[in-house]
């Protein structure tokens, strides 16, 4: 998402249609407190960031309240009065849904239904990944709502589960971010376990889909 303007690289993340985080990496200005100026309406005056992110004591980003805005962020990163990067972006391109909350498991013989609280906006996919110590890779199933039934499980095996939310690519475009994974939960014979024996440490989720 970065730009070539004066060697400034930017990253935008729109957290759950609530908060926008814009971070920058500008090697030329590594010891400079760049300022961030923004507006959500092209006709308004720019406001300056009031919630900076710092790296090694210097500004490296800004957090903005942007709740439920399907709209454009106009922004300018400046060195004093000199703009070093100026852009306007549709924020939804950079959506990152929040991690699933209130994850529950309902077992019935060789199947489990995983549910969680649906987010307040649509066009999302709720993905459950699971594996047993005997599986070399995570298995995956996803649905349009957080109600995912996985069948064909072996009641004697211990399974690890985790859940995340992804923005539908056909709606939000391909450059969004999946949510963070929920915590891993381990189950065997319909009962929760502290861990599954010999389960490798789950891989960290990739930002790309």
């Amino acid at each position: 998402q970065g730009g070539a303007a004066e060697g400034v690289q930017i990253q935008i993340i729109y957290f759950n249609l609530e908060t926008v985080q814009v971070t920058w990496n500008a090697s030329k200005y590594s010891r400079t407190n760049l300022t961030f100026h923004y507006r959500f309406n092209g006709d308004e005056a720019y406001d300056q960031c009031t919630n900076y992110l710092l790296q090694e004591g210097h500004t490296s980003g800004c957090l903005l309240d942007a709740e439920q805005r399907d709209d454009i962020l106009y922004f300018s990163i400046r060195n004093g009065t000199h703009p070093v990067f100026t852009a306007s972006r549709w924020m939804v391109y950079y959506l990152k849904p929040s991690s699933p909350k209130h994850v529950r498991f309902s077992w019935h013989q060789d199947a489990v239904t995983v549910t969680c609280s649906d987010l307040s906006y649509g066009d999302l996919l709720y993905e459950v990944q699971y594996r047993s110590p005997f599986d070399t890779e995570w298995q995956s199933k996803q649905e349009n709502t957080c109600n995912v039934t996985i069948e064909g499980l072996d009641a004697e095996k211990c399974y690890s589960f985790w859940v995340r939310v992804k923005a539908m690519e056909d709606v939000y475009g391909p450059d969004t971010y999946p949510s963070d994974w929920s915590e891993v939960t381990c189950w065997q014979r319909g009962e929760i376990r502290d861990a599954c024996a010999e389960t490798p440490t789950p891989p960290k989720p990739k930002l790309s889909k």
Epitope: Q1, G3, A4, W90, V171, G173, D175
Partner: antibody, heavy 122, light 107 residues
Framework: QVQLQESGPGLVKPSQTLSLTCTVS??????????WSWIRQHPGKGLEWIGY???????YYSPSLKSRVTISRDTSKNQFSLKLSSVTAADTAVYYC??????????????WGQGTLVTVSS | DIQMTQSPSSLSASVGDRVTITCRAS??????LHWYQHRPGETPKLLIK???RSISGVPSRFSGSGSGTDFTLTISSLQPEDFATYYC?????????FGQGTKLEIK
């Protein structure tokens, strides 16, 4: 199959207002998620986006033309319209109406009209 | 505005040739880059969306690649109906902007 057709005068006098209408058939302009655009092409030049009107009637205009542009719609006729005021010879162009693909919100233009040439001249 | 620069601006090729057109954005746009074909007297036609995603009804000889600032449209084996002008367009930046076009002519 969605079809778009531009209509309006082919000749406009300088300082007057250019008015064009796009009639959409085979698809409702109020369908959620879709945006409807005007795009123009100056003779021998590339394409220039003018503005959108959304399924929810929200409008967005190109900053360079914003002070002169109005896009509106008539849902009963399934039409949307462009008004460009205070025209000069520099507004002479082929004007296209187009639909934005539902994806990434307001992305690629997947259906276009044939285009209509508007000449600004006295 | 994000500037889109296409190269070459014109290109002569023969039926059966493999042709590549490039598009460069002045700022990174991820993969939100779309390609169009415009034949004289016809409506512009969407060929590729989001850098590499095919569009239903578009022949498989058209393919796209790239991300960030550099993108490519490839026609694997030119057909007579492919001689046209091709445009790229970015969408995450506002306003949407197009390249200046690449005119593909018969050699």
């Amino acid at each position: 199959q969605v079809q778009l057709q531009e209509s309006g005068p082919g000749l406009v006098k300088p300082s007057q207002t250019l008015s064009l209408t796009c009639t959409v058939s085979g698809f409702s302009i109020t369908t959620s998620g879709y945006y409807w655009s005007w795009i123009r092409q100056h003779p021998g030049k590339g394409l220039e986006w003018i503005g959108y009107i959304g399924y929810n009637s929200k409008t967005y205009y190109s900053p360079s033309l914003k002070s002169r542009v109005t896009i509106s719609r008539d849902t009963s006729k399934n039409q949307f319209s462009l008004k460009l005021s205070s025209v000069t010879a520099a507004d002479t162009a082929v004007y296209y109406c187009a639909r934005s693909l539902y994806g990434g919100y307001k992305d690629a233009f997947d259906s276009w009209g044939q285009g209509t040439l508007v000449t600004v001249s006295s | 505005d994000i500037q889109m620069t296409q190269s070459p601006s014109s290109l002569s090729a023969s039926v059966g040739d493999r042709v590549t057109i490039t598009c460069r954005a002045s700022q990174s746009i991820g993969t939100s880059l779309h390609w169009y074909q415009h034949r004289p007297g016809e409506t512009p036609k969407l060929l590729i969306k989001f850098a590499s995603r095919s569009i239903s009804g578009v022949p498989s000889r058209f393919s796209g690649s790239g991300s960030g600032t550099d993108f490519t449209l490839t026609i694997s084996s030119l057909q007579p109906e492919d001689f046209a002008t091709y445009y790229c367009q970015q969408s995450p930046g506002f306003p949407p902007t197009f390249g200046q076009g690449t005119k593909l002519e018969i050699k």
